[in-house]
Amino acid sequence: MKVLQEPTCVSDYMSISTCEWKMNGPTNCSTELRLLYQLVFLLSEAHTCIPENNGGAGCVCHLLMDDVVSADNYTLDLWAGQQLLWKGSFKPSEHVKPRAPGNLTVHTNVSDTLLLTWSNPYPPDNYLYNHLTYAVNIWSENDPADFRIYNVTYLEPSLRIAASTLKSGISYRARVRAWAQCYNTTWSEWSPSTKWHNSYREPFEQH
């Protein structure tokens, strides 16, 4: 039994880091493998993660942390029974993938303006809370070419757009994701999408 692709991990910079790797053949990850992880800090415990399958030879493990600070470093040991297959380390602050924003809502009752709001996925005491920027994706269910991205570079989790920038009388969907420049993070996953029917009053044409 050998590791084909070494574990790579990403942290949500809050309480969970996710590690994925591939073995050299079909593996029952939960019965055959154990990933031990330990914060490099005097008298910290070595915790054990039971991995789950992620495709035939792929395994995934969720490492639990109470909190994360930039100096944290974890040792990782991948075991098959008493055989050490791989040894490595992981610094959560250097591999951050933010949590996905939630509660995306489209408010259509503000004159002819669409107001999209969502929730910041972090509590106020988390460092990322004040460092997230967002991308909002809006697309038409009827027309695959009608697909747009709005970059929200301010901190407020909201976006206002004129309803008239979208076609009237058809349904649209929106979703949002986040990233933090300060830690050079990857993008979060997209939030669940929300749907609305876009309609607005066409302005009278004067002749």
Partner: antibody, heavy 128, light 109 residues
């Protein structure tokens, strides 16, 4: 200095109640863990009582004999309690607080494993 | 709950002796076994976890082995400070319970 300090022990009458406290200090705030209680009757072996997860989930595990009369709770990730009710003479023991590692499968299935660091213990005597 | 059967309950040995203590679990606990040393009036001290991993600061004369149901703690060359009581601790992931063995008292011969 990394340490666990128990308090609240003393003499109590049979049928009475007592709440023990455990305060942890010197640990990294990043390290998730369980906080557990273990007791030792005079001249006897060690007996696990139960554990509570110190993170936000707060899940608890108890020895089968401890369910009902003993309750573990937490005020924070660094302070935990052991509430003992309907105490009997056989509950006379030194009660230790211990910090524990865990095994997890996913993010919701987490159980306590070995006890890495122990407090100095607090004595409980149940006697009339 | 699982049961942990530790043997012997006591033993007499001399400084320099090789000492072996065994622990048997009533069900398969993989490698979820730890060993502790306790001296009179003191809290237990972790020696070994995951059946064979030496805890921080523990001398290398202590070693652990085994997996599944049968486990062993070995002291390769007994030192004066090693006279104490030793406990195994088995952890069952099916129930989340932790059970200690009855203890082994290591006395001076």
């Amino acid at each position: 200095e990394v340490q666990l300090v128990e308090s609240g022990g003393g003499r109590v009458q049979p049928g009475g109640s007592l709440r023990l406290s455990c305060a942890a200090s010197g640990f990294s705030s990043s390290s998730a863990h369980y906080m557990c209680w273990v007791r030792q009757a005079p001249g006897k072996g060690l007996e696990w009582i139960g554990c509570i997860y110190a993170g936000s989930r707060g899940s608890t595990y108890y020895a089968s004999w401890a369910k009902g009369r003993f309750t573990i709770s937490k005020a924070s990730s660094t302070t935990v309690y052991l509430q003992m009710n309907s105490l009997r003479a056989e509950d006379t023991a030194t009660y230790y607080c211990a910090r524990a590692a865990f095994v997890n499968r996913g993010v919701s299935w987490i159980w306590p494993y070995y006890f890495s660091l122990w407090g100095q213990g607090t004595q409980v005597t149940v006697s009339s | 709950d699982i049961q942990m059967t530790q043997s012997p309950s006591s033993l007499s040995a001399s400084v320099g002796d090789r000492v072996t203590i065994t622990c048997q679990a009533s069900e398969d606990i993989e490698s979820y076994l730890a060993w502790y040393q306790q001296k009179p009036g003191k809290a237990p001290k972790l020696l070994i976890y995951r059946a064979s991993t030496l805890a921080y600061g523990v001398p290398s004369r202590f070693s652990g082995s085994g997996s599944g149901t049968d486990f062993t703690l070995t002291i390769s060359s007994l030192q004066p400070e090693d006279f104490a009581t030793y406990y195994c601790l088995g952890s069952s992931y099916s129930t989340g319970s932790n059970i200690f063995g009855q203890g082994t008292k290591v006395e001076i011969k």
